[in-house]
């Protein structure tokens, strides 16, 4: 499955929107830094494209879920959030088309299922952190920074997959 060129443009726009969403000086939030344990190994180059697409899809779906909550709506600018949702939704559509193309071709590798589970647990840790921090502005900024980093790493994987073709 070939992801359209617009997909990587959408990824860049998503990162730009995340950057624009910032609301407070980050320097006041240093002590709120947290190790969320991003499962970087699940986005390593050892994966075949067919195995990677569902993991990337899960990643973007979880980002969508995280920023779709009422707590998120209270934390961020509504206009930017709407643009953010639109970009994520388009990327999910692109990836879903690839997932559907791949159905029935091979058995779902156990490794892929483990990777999806690792991504879900990662987002559970993020959600728990926000809850423990009572959804404070700094907690949201730490999470935004973390999502920018993890999204960027997963985007780099998409680019490396495209360049290998």
């Amino acid at each position: 499955c070939d992801l359209p060129q617009t997909h990587s443009l959408g990824s860049r726009r998503t990162l730009m929107l995340l950057a624009q969403m910032r609301r407070i000086s980050l320097f006041s939030c240093l002590k709120d830094r947290h190790d969320f344990g991003f499962p970087q190994e699940e986005f390593g180059n050892q994966f075949q494209k067919a195995e990677t697409i569902p993991v990337l899809h899960e990643m973007i779906q979880q980002i969508f879920n995280l920023f779709s909550t009422k707590d998120s709506s209270a934390a961020w600018d509504e206009t930017l959030l709407d643009k953010f949702y639109t970009e994520l939704y388009q990327q999910l559509n692109d990836l879903e088309a690839c997932v559907i193309q791949g159905v029935g071709v091979t058995e779902t590798p156990l490794m892929k299922e483990d990777s999806i589970l690792a991504v879900r647990k990662y987002f559970q840790r993020i959600t728990l952190y926000l809850k423990e921090k009572k959804y404070s502005p700094c907690a949201w900024e730490v999470v935004r920074a973390e999502i920018m980093r993890s999204f960027s790493l997963s985007t780099n994987l998409q680019e490396s997959l495209r360049s290998k073709e």
Epitope: A19, R22, S25, L26, F27, C29, L30, K31, D32, R33, H34, D35, F36, E141, V142, A145, E146, M148, R149, S152
Partner: antibody, heavy 121, light 107 residues
Amino acid sequence: EVQLVQSGAEVKKPGESLKISCKGSGYSFTSYWIGWVRQMPGKGLEWMGIIDPSDSDTAYSPSFQGQVTISADKSISTAYLQWSSLKASDTAMYYCARHPGLNWAPDFDYWGQGTLVTVSS
Amino acid sequence: DIQMTQSPSSLSASVGDRVTITCRASQSIGKSLNWYQQKPGKAPKLLIYFASSLQSGVPSRFSGSGSGTDFTLTISSLQPEDFATYYCQQSYDFPLTFGQGTKVEIK
């Protein structure tokens, strides 16, 4: 390869102004903060301040607030440290280093080679 | 401001020795503590971050431990290239602060 390259050594007179630079390459410049550290001859490390190049937000150590200005030009991936009126006590080696911001990642993992500033009449 | 106090300020040791440097923060900083090595005329080099994580490319003879206010840098078997000055630095809150340094010299 990640690199921070600083401008060359400077010899200045008291009262003169100066702007030294730190150019980042091999990484996304706006994804990391840039910190400045002073080391006076034979002394330890002193943190001066930091900048977020994505929007030029800055934070200073109280010891350096008002004494120096930190700025950045993200279009050329460069951070700056400047003085409007140098004093003999500003004689030191100045280092820039990158910081991961709010991410749980190594702090000051890459450093510039240092810029030696000598202020003497 | 958070004060960082290193001890000792200097020490003499031989190649193969186990060396321990301690750093104390004036208030709890969790695990937000870094260790750097600096050789004369060179920029500092990150060894340990977040109290115990070994920076990529740093030999495994270097290790860090501690949390809260008390931290330790250990060199399990001192090598000739380890003779340098070591600094701790808190990254918990601004202003960031360094310890005064520990100079490791040849006995």
